[in-house]
């Protein structure tokens, strides 16, 4: 016997869609009188938001589908509802079975600069120096693709001198320098880097944008003939 | 390294309500389950509850009426109330952190021992 | 609920033999549509909170030494320490999460023979 079931269903689906079926069997004579015949009901479900009654089950089936929009996997990420099977065809004997619904991930956050505004010092010549780690906040499930974050330098790099990475742990975008900068020639750079996921996203999202002005620090070199 | 630890009174009065917090550091509380679970001495572990950062919770039944949870992400907190406490409550206390949205539990606190005694 | 059963209770093993705990639980915890078996296993050493080793009945957790191992599908699961080393003695718990009413075994009490 099984008194508790899984299903999933991604967030954001339309009202109608079906999640999962769930059955009970009655040994009783369900032809030629209703002893076996069961119909199945939504007792509770936990929790009760964004209100109570976000699903639905086919009296005969048992198939459990989506009745109300807003699924929201940001807000709640399962399901418990609580099935009610009775023979009879409703008027008999009651069994009760558990059905957890896990609320499947859309990428519907973009990742988010925390801060937008940074300041970097940076050795002129060096190359590969790490400038600046870039910090977003994403709501998506965490080190899924709709979380992972993608960098992109947008402006300001028209020399080709920088170079950005994910952090494959913390999600950070790591500037690093990709050639020598030369302070005598330029002694700061004002970077523009935009930042989107792995995955794309399932609506139209703003994308977050950073700031970042590196200022390039003064070496002494030598005098050269 | 995501940490957790667990503080409140280490005795509650029978019939009181027993309160805890458990603050996380090294991570942020966004996007997870936290859980709480208590385990009397030399015996098992029992899961009271869980809440999701958004605020949803979900109970032990056999506790759901005594138990209500919350969190506070701006402290990156959450807590627990257990109320009309008694001796059957006197156990060691812990928190811990959700592994994806499962049941699994991959980062804990160190424990409490709360005491119901007069 | 879904009720987990382990046995033994205690178990003595002598320092480099295998140990072997098992777990039953009283429905299957084998999801089908992902075929992963929601089934966890925890060490818990004195004074200590328990400490995950294995998810998904057989995925070891990071840094958990490869000597610890799991096994099984639907409601039948076995721990299984190749060679028992002396900080392994400890507490070891199974746990269902395929429900959301979490629930443990009794534990199992191992020690060094």
């Known amino acids: 016997t099984q008194d508790t079931f899984r299903g999933s269903v991604l967030e954001g689906v339309l009202p109608g869609t079906s999640v999962m079926q769930v059955t009970a069997t009655d040994e009783d004579d369900a032809i030629y009188t209703y002893n076996g015949v069961v119909a199945y009901s939504i007792h509770s479900q936990e929790p009760k938001d964004p209100h109570d009654l976000m699903f639905t089950i086919h009296r005969s089936t048992g198939t459990i589908s989506v009745i109300s929009s807003g699924l929201d996997r940001e807000k709640v990420p399962e399901y418990t509802l609580t099935i009610q099977a009775t023979d009879m065809d409703g008027d008999g004997s009651t069994t009760t079975a558990v059905a957890v619904v896990e609320i499947l991930d859309a990428n519907d956050n973009a990742p988010m600069f925390d801060p937008q505004k940074y300041e970097a010092h940076v050795p002129e010549n060096a190359v590969g120096h790490e400038v600046q780690r870039l910090t977003v906040t994403d709501l998506d499930a965490p080190n899924s693709p709709a979380w992972r974050a993608t960098y992109l330098i947008m402006g300001g790099d028209d020399g080709d001198h920088f170079t950005i990475t994910t952090h494959p742990e913390s999600n950070q975008g790591i500037l690093t320098t990709r050639k020598g900068l030369d302070f005598e020639a330029k002694n700061q750079h004002t970077l523009y880097v935009e930042v989107t996921n792995e995955a794309p996203f399932v609506l139209k999202l703003p994308t977050s944008t950073a700031t970042i002005v590196v200022h390039v620090e003064d070496v002494n070199e030598a005098p050269v003939f | 390294q995501v940490q957790l630890q667990e503080s409140g009174p280490g005795l509650v009065k029978p019939s009181e309500t027993l309160s805890l917090t458990c603050t996380v550091s090294g991570g942020s509380i966004s996007s997870y389950y936290w859980s709480w679970f208590r385990q009397p001495a030399g015996k098992g572990l029992e899961w009271i509850g869980r809440i999701y950062s958004s605020g949803s919770t979900n109970y032990n039944p056999s506790l759901k009426s005594r138990v209500t949870m919350s969190v506070d992400t701006s402290k990156n907190q959450f807590s627990l109330k257990l109320s009309s406490v008694t001796a059957a409550d006197t156990a060691v206390y812990y928190c811990a952190r959700g592994m994806g949205v499962t049941g699994l539990f991959d980062y804990w606190g160190q424990g409490t021992l709360v005491t119901v005694s007069s | 609920d879904i009720v987990m059963t382990q046995s033994p209770d205690s178990l003595a093993v002598s320092l480099g033999e295998r140990a072997t705990i098992n777990c039953k639980s009283s429905?299957?915890?084998?999801?089908?549509?992902?075929?992963?078996?929601?089934l966890a296993w925890y060490q818990q050493k004195p004074g200590q909170p328990p400490k995950l080793l294995i998810y998904?009945?057989?995925t070891r957790e990071s840094g958990v030494p490869d000597r610890f191992s799991g096994s099984g599908s639907g409601t039948d699961f076995t721990l299984t320490i190749s060679s028992l080393q002396a900080e392994d003695v400890a507490v070891y718990y199974c746990q269902q999460y395929y429900s959301t009413m979490y629930t443990f075994g009794q534990g199992t009490k191992l020690e060094i023979k």
């Open positions: 429905q299957s915890v084998l999801y089908s549509s992902n075929n992963k078996n929601y």
């Open positions: 998904w009945a057989s």
